[in-house]
């Protein structure tokens, strides 16, 4: 059993989640990658790249865009116009078969809340990144990064078991609470 630290990202409705999933290019450069959401115990594949992966050939499925950079060992995931119902646990995986996927670390717990003014994308910007400087408050410090390790609430004592044949991955003691500021 491999223990993963779940990272929590807080967004407002209408914003864009942009993550990068890191992989060993020697192993997985030519593999298909997928973005999945955990629904109960079973993951649901939301989008997957073509095979073989090629640089700068984005795959778009609704509001999700995947762009693989096999030369750099990175998969870029964009989820635009986030909605409250998008909240949940997401993972990048190496997609080998619908029932068999290798999880790329770390899982992301996405929390989407209504904008303070009640309108989607009510922040200055609708795309955003994460602040990188530790902060003693939960205050949003700037649009591109988040305060790593700014705990905005008591981390839940939870364990999520990802159902992938041959391996059980437990997500325990969510400690990396990330506050994501905004930019349009």
């Amino acid at each position: 059993t491999t223990e993963l630290t779940e990272e929590k990202y807080e967004y407002k409705e209408g914003q864009t989640l942009e993550v990068k999933c890191d992989y060993a290019l020697e192993k997985y450069a030519n593999s298909r990658k997928a973005w999945q959401k955990m629904e109960g115990k079973m993951p649901k594949i939301l989008a997957k790249t073509e095979r073989p992966s090629e640089n700068s050939h984005p795959v778009q499925v609704g509001r999700i865009t995947l762009e693989d950079y096999p030369d750099h060992g990175l998969l870029q995931v964009r989820m635009t116009n986030l909605q409250v119902e998008d909240s949940g646990l997401y993972q990048c995986v190496i997609y080998q078969h619908p029932k068999e996927s290798h999880v790329l670390f770390n899982p992301i717990c996405l929390v989407v809340t209504k904008g303070s003014s009640g309108t989607p994308g009510s922040s200055e910007n609708s795309t955003q990144n994460v602040y990188r400087t530790p902060s003693t408050t939960a205050k949003a410090l700037g649009p591109r990064y988040t305060s790593p390790r700014t705990v905005t609430q008591a981390p839940p004592e939870s364990t999520v078991v990802v159902s992938t044949p041959g391996s059980e991955i437990n997500l325990t003691n969510v400690t990396d609470i990330i506050r994501v500021p905004v930019f349009n």
Epitope: V19, D22, S56, E67, N129
Partner: antibody, heavy 122, light 107 residues
């Protein structure tokens, strides 16, 4: 405070290799990418690639692929960039720079090492 | 690769002048653009990230704007300590690319 401290200047012969180190302090080393950027005298900045210190996975710009290797030692919070088969045009200042968090699509270089001059001359 | 074209390549202005530098991307990069200041013999220093956000500790006379392919960096009132080369950098797509730099001098 966050600091990146690089190893000293190097003089190398064509065909040799050089390994530059970058020691990080003041933050959690494994939470942020380390990038390498070089600058030849009087020239612009050129990104060479990035490494995720947590996983050790790295990716390189095409111009350098096959010649560059980026590694790390997490126990001493140090990143390394090794460039092999050196030629005169590799003479440049090599910088390490901290990028965004490893899981976020952010390549904003907020802290830089002081630079290491690598001179390639016969 | 995305090409970043900076202009002018150099400029000379008086203390107190408003200085504007432009950076043009060869394709849409949204707001994924950063600006750095580099003084001779020193490492670059982040000034502006994501087009318009001022890095902590950077004087408010520096600002940035733009979106898509056209971006502007402004020094509202040039100071003697602003003598440096300024570089833009995009990170919308890999590989990351920098502009050619703009050298700012005092008249």
């Amino acid at each position: 405070q966050v600091q990146l401290v690089q190893s000293g200047a190097e003089v190398k012969k064509p065909g040799a290799s050089v390994k530059v180190s970058c020691k990080a302090s003041g933050y959690t080393f494994t939470s942020y990418d380390i990038n390498w950027v070089r600058q030849a005298t009087g020239q612009g900045l050129e990104w060479m690639g990035r490494m995720n210190p947590k996983s050790g996975n790295a990716g390189y710009v095409q111009n350098f692929r096959g010649r560059v290797t980026m590694t790390r030692n997490t126990s001493i919070s140090t990143a390394y960039m090794e460039l092999s088969s050196l030629r005169s045009e590799d003479t440049a200042v090599y910088y390490c720079a901290r990028g965004g968090r490893t899981s976020i699509w952010s390549f904003v270089f907020d802290y830089w090492g002081q630079g290491t001059l690598v001179t390639v001359s016969s | 690769d995305i090409q970043m074209t900076q202009s002018p390549s150099s400029l000379s202005a008086s203390v107190g002048d408003r200085v504007t530098i432009t950076c043009q991307a060869s394709q849409d990069i949204s707001k994924h653009l950063n600006w750095y200041q580099q003084k001779p013999g020193k490492a670059p220093k982040l000034l502006i990230y994501d087009t318009s956000n001022l890095e902590t500790g950077v004087p408010s006379r520096f600002s940035g704007s733009g979106s898509g392919t056209d971006f502007t960096f402004t020094i509202s009132s040039l100071q003697p300590e602003d003598i440096a080369t300024y570089n833009c950098q995009q990170y919308d797509k890999l590989p990351l690319t920098f502009g050619g730099g703009t050298k700012v001098e005092i008249k």
